[in-house]
């Protein structure tokens, strides 16, 4: 319950939240659970804590491991894990099962995709869409904010979605994608 | 110094109503989910209700669903237990207590109790 | 609900002797598992959260372990005045739950 997987890829940013939720007064302390090294909070490092959140900016395959979150109220510290794995970018379109998000379901009368983990960023509209690699085109295909709204749908737009966007820190820039499975259901 | 106290327990006939209350002081009370626990005499300890924060949102046990409703005034400090229909089994010493962490969706322990107020339902 | 079931329901010791008193889960409740002392006339005290953190001013000889639906709170020497009950609470969801108690008393 209090550890959570995260993945992401190499040279995208990722951002990981502690499992372990508190109140927004409370202060976090981020460690490399391997070394018990504390992580900075300076946000000129590469990674660093920042509250309630570890950033990757950008990750790299050496970042993998367990981080240890612990979140300290006056009169509690309560402990949550992240468990942290960076891949490599794959050179061919396949998107492996262990780089996919959740799947989700729709029908014709409701088609959202949500861009997985996209809250946890600083990011701004556009975002890019695409299924099986390829870019969406057509009006039936509208990034509303955080979400993919497929207008008509039909069997053939089952698959794997990738949002993409850019999140940014300190006026640099980041990029990050995400994928998941889409199948579409009868009414 | 975080001090609760419980106030409005009572002899009550079955059927009857009451309405408890607990003071709270020492601490800011609206970011605080907060609890009412029972003890029936030598008996052991029985949740019955808690409420959110500032956002409110309220759960009960199944033995005092529809009977109970508890709610808090947060410019007054003070924690609320409207109990109706009473029955005997309701008959217990009860507690206010503050859940110290608890963000939405989750629960934590109770770090503070106040010193409780019997109820008595009989005829 | 999830039940909590604490054994015994009675342990007589002497001062100075170990106490261990186990709680049972009926299913995961992870480490959202805390422990309480209550005296005659007193409300409950908090002693134990997330299976084995102390909470502050809680002396040391109060340990808790477990994880899942095990869990043991150990007192290593009793003084005289850890004679009391000892309830678990689980706080993993609603309804939170008690166990029913186990009373530590003087042998």
């Known amino acids: 319950k209090f550890s959570k997987q995260s993945w992401g890829l190499e040279n995208e940013a990722l951002i990981v939240r502690c499992p372990r939720q508190g109140k927004p007064s409370y202060t976090v302390d981020w460690y490399y659970s391997q070394t018990n090294k504390s992580i900075p909070t300076q946000e000129r490092n590469r990674v660093f804590a920042s509250g309630q959140l570890l950033k990757f900016l950008p990750a790299r395959v050496a970042d993998s491991g367990i981080y240890t979150c612990i979140v300290r109220s006056p009169t509690f510290n309560r402990t949550g894990y992240a468990n942290v794995t960076i891949y490599k970018k794959q050179s061919d379109c396949n998107v492996p099962d262990y780089l996919m998000y959740s799947t989700v379901s729709g029908s014709e009368k409701n088609s959202k995709i949500y861009c997985p983990t996209i809250d946890l960023y600083n990011w701004t509209a556009p975002l890019e869409w695409f299924k099986n690699c390829q870019a969406l085109q057509g009006s039936r295909y509208r990034a509303h904010k955080s979400f993919l709204v497929i207008d008509n749908v039909m069997t053939e737009d089952a698959g794997d979605y990738t949002c993409k966007f850019i999140h940014n820190e300190n006026g640099a820039n980041y990029s990050v994608t995400a994928t998941r499975s889409f199948t579409v259901k009868d009414e | 110094e975080v001090q609760l106290l419980e106030s409005g327990g009572g002899l009550v006939q079955p059927g009857g109503s009451l309405r408890l209350s607990c003071a709270a002081s020492?601490?800011?009370?609206?970011?605080?989910?907060m609890i009412w626990v029972r003890q029936a005499p030598g008996k052991g300890l029985e949740w019955v209700s808690s409420?959110?924060?500032?956002?409110?949102?309220?759960y009960y046990a199944d033995s005092v669903k529809g009977r109970f409703t508890i709610s808090r005034d947060n410019s007054k400090n003070t924690l609320y237990l409207q109990m109706n229909s009473l029955r005997a089994e309701d008959t217990a010493v009860y507690y206010c207590?503050?859940?110290?962490?608890?963000?939405?969706?989750?629960?934590?322990?109770?770090?503070?109790w106040g010193q409780g107020t019997l109820v008595t339902v009989s005829s | 609900e999830i039940v909590l079931t604490q054994s015994p329901a009675t342990l007589s010791l002497s001062p100075g002797e170990r106490a261990t008193l186990s709680c049972r889960a009926s299913q995961s409740v992870d480490d959202d598992l805390a422990w309480y002392q209550q005296k005659p006339g007193q409300a409950p005290r908090l002693l134990i959260y997330?299976?084995?953190n102390r909470a502050t001013g809680i002396p040391a000889r109060f340990s808790g372990s477990g994880s899942g639906t095990d869990f043991t709170l150990t007192i290593s020497s009793l003084e005289p005045e850890d004679f009391a009950v000892y309830y678990c609470?689980?706080?993993?969801?609603?309804?939170?739950?008690f166990g029913q108690g186990t009373k530590v008393e003087i042998k």
């Open positions: 997330d299976a084995s």
């Open positions: 409420i959110r924060g500032e956002g409110g949102g309220t």
């Open positions: 609470q689980q706080y993993i969801t609603a309804p939170l739950t």
């Open positions: 020492g601490f800011t009370f609206s970011i605080y989910d």
């Open positions: 207590a503050r859940d110290p962490w608890s963000t939405e969706g989750s629960f934590f322990v109770l770090d503070y």
